[in-house]
């Protein structure tokens, strides 16, 4: 025969936070470490599960197919209730009745989801929405992989995603001094570098590489490289290509220059030789299937030429160089040097020997070209 449970038998209510889709274990312990009768009910007094004899029985609640108990722990006086595949509507006060005592546990289930696809282009915005039970007033704090902290309530917005935002975001939901942690994987679709510059001597082969800052199982799309040569009045499409399951196939390529493109990732292009007429800047765009917008990478080509014509030794560079770069001509193992923050330097009547043309940035050599000046013998005067 069961005794009535008085108010003083009602233990203080515990608060447990759960995550949508996860499993939670609500504990209930008897004072005696032995198997005894227990029941779990919801706030409407509907039985969820309990013990009858030695068997677990389930009541008519909505949880019946998702609720369970650890039978192996019953003889230790532990009568927990496990709820699988949590739903927001599972948030409720659950009552465990054991040994004429009632233990109340308030379960609050939260869900945190990205409003859109978690694969977003650089510059696009990310919105995280918190699902929470009625009557709760949680706060959310998210930390990006790069260490950026963002706080919010029901929604958290990141207006412009950057490359370094790719990775696992850790979001902490707090309610009643309790916390639950969510991890959301965000992939920012971008090239590893926004811009790169290739420095080459005239005639050398040029390599352009466009590594992606992400990996996808299936990568499909199309791309194009537009080129604005310094000497040209308008830009020109150098190559268009398709990408299907990470395989690159060239659709159309300009005849001058005759580019080669690799068929495997990372996207890779080679130019047979660096020439002044190719110096300039390009923009490679990649449109991915089922994504709005395009990925961009800028690439610059700087070409150097050292020439000797009659009594003039000249060194020139073409392409996008910053005004702080220094161009110098110096004679090897000698002090003779001429330097300018310009795109051309020259020496009249240069001494014989090996001359070096150097393009430098604050002392760091970006590009060098050697040219040998042979001694010029005076022409004998005709009688």
């Amino acid at each position: 025969e069961q005794k009535l449970i008085s108010e003083e038998d009602l233990a203080a209510k515990k608060v447990v936070l759960g995550k949508k889709g996860d499993t939670v274990e609500l504990t209930c312990n008897a004072s005696q470490k032995k198997n005894t009768q227990f029941h779990w009910k919801n706030s409407n007094q509907i039985k969820i599960l309990g013990i009858q004899g030695l068997f677990l029985t389930k009541g008519p609640s909505k949880l019946s197919d998702r609720a369970d108990s650890r039978k192996s722990l019953w003889d230790q006086g532990c009568f927990s209730m496990i709820i699988k595949n949590l739903k927001i509507e599972d948030s409720d006060t659950y009552i465990c009745e054991v040994e004429n005592k009632k233990e109340e546990v308030e379960l609050l289930v939260f869900g945190l989801t990205a409003n859109s696809d978690t694969h977003l282009l650089e510059g696009q915005s990310l919105t995280l929405t918190l699902e929470s039970p009625p009557g709760s007033s949680p706060s959310v704090k998210c930390r990006s992989p790069g260490g950026k902290n963002i706080q919010g309530g029901r929604t958290i917005s990141v207006p412009q995603l950057e490359r370094q935002d790719s990775g696992t975001w850790t979001c902490t939901v707090s309610q009643d001094q309790k916390t639950v942690e969510f991890k959301i994987d965000i992939v920012v679709l971008a090239f590893q570098k926004a811009s790169s510059t290739v420095y080459k001597k005239e005639g050398e082969q040029v390599e352009f590489s466009f590594p992606l800052a992400f990996t996808l199982e299936k990568l499909t799309g199309s791309g194009e490289l537009w080129w604005q040569a310094e000497r040209a009045s308008s830009s020109k499409s150098w190559i268009t290509f398709d990408l299907k399951n990470k395989e690159v196939s060239v659709k159309r390529v300009t005849q001058d220059p005759k580019l080669q493109m690799g068929k495997k990732l990372p996207l890779h292009l080679t130019l047979p030789q660096a020439l002044p007429q190719y110096a300039g800047s390009g923009n490679l765009t990649l449109a991915l299937e089922a994504k709005t917008g395009k990925l961009h990478q800028e690439v610059n080509l700087v070409v150097m030429r050292a020439t000797q014509f009659q009594e003039n030794l000249t060194c020139e560079v073409w392409g996008p160089t910053s005004p702080k770069l220094t161009l110098s001509l110096k004679l090897e193992n000698k002090g003779a040097t001429v330097s300018k923050q310009a795109k051309a330097v020259w020496v009249l009547n240069p001494e014989a020997g090996m001359w070096q043309c150097l393009l430098s940035d604050s002392g760091q050599v970006l590009l060098e070209s050697n040219i040998k000046v042979v001694p010029t013998w005076p022409t004998p005067v005709q009688p």
């Epitope: 082969q205 299907k244 399951n245 990470k246 395989e247 060239v250 068929k263």
Partner: antibody, heavy 119, light 107 residues
């Protein structure tokens, strides 16, 4: 076990046609890139034609462009090479070859089939 | 098309020798290069892929190196079964191209 078995070679007159087949088994034919490679008697290897696994795109060496057609029948796991306007210089042993999953070289080859173009 | 220049075209060596074969591409091809061995009347066999990766089942005396335009196949200690013809193949892009081959003969 991966197997590639070529057939369809033989003697053909200049200007004639021939269709080579390569029956494949032991791997996922539909997603693998495949190629035909030939070797003229006493000469080196020459890549002839290829078909992409991912998009079915076809590619040819300049020496056969416009005359040869590569194709595949996924339901039959078979690769084909349709050879038209054959010339004496097309005489060779033709091999069918399977590319590695990530397009790094040909890891499996057939035993080859001899095509002789002669009058 | 990318041209592949292989050297030497023939080579005489003895069992136990260290042998090196080189291949040069007319364009930068990253590491998209394979090495093949062919014996008379047989189909070629892949030895090295991606310039330096040893194909499964191939003895470790075979090694590959290089990147960009210059590549090398090295056999550290020649065995009797290694006398064959060796080819490089660029698979950077289509049309693929083979080197002319190097015939390795017994001295």
């Amino acid at each position: 076990e991966v197997q590639l078995l070529e057939s369809g070679g033989g003697l053909v007159q200049p200007g004639g046609s021939l269709r080579l087949s390569c029956a494949a088994s032991g791997f996922t034919f539909s997603t693998n890139a495949m190629s035909w490679v030939r070797q003229a008697p006493g000469k080196g290897l020459e890549w002839v034609s290829g078909i992409s696994g991912s998009n079915g795109n076809t590619y040819y060496a300049d020496s056969v462009k416009g005359r040869f057609i590569i194709s595949r029948d996924i339901s039959k796991n078979t690769l084909y090479l349709e050879m038209n306007s054959l010339r004496a210089e097309d005489t060779a042993v033709y091999y069918c070859a399977k590319e590695r999953d990530n397009w790094n070289g040909f890891d499996y080859w057939g035993q080859g089939t001899l095509v002789t173009v002669s009058s | 098309a990318i041209q592949m220049t292989q050297s030497p075209s023939s080579l005489s060596a003895s069992v136990g020798d260290r042998v090196t074969i080189t291949c040069r591409a007319s364009h930068v091809i990253r590491n998209d290069l394979g090495w093949y061995q062919q014996k008379p009347g047989k189909a070629p066999k892949l030895l090295i892929y991606a310039a330096s990766s040893l194909q499964s089942g191939v003895p470790s005396r075979f090694s590959g190196s290089g990147s960009g335009t210059d590549f090398t196949l090295t056999i550290s200690s020649l065995q009797p079964e290694d006398f064959a013809t060796y080819y490089c193949l660029q698979d950077y892009n289509y049309p693929y191209t083979f080197g002319q081959g190097t015939k390795l003969e017994i001295k």
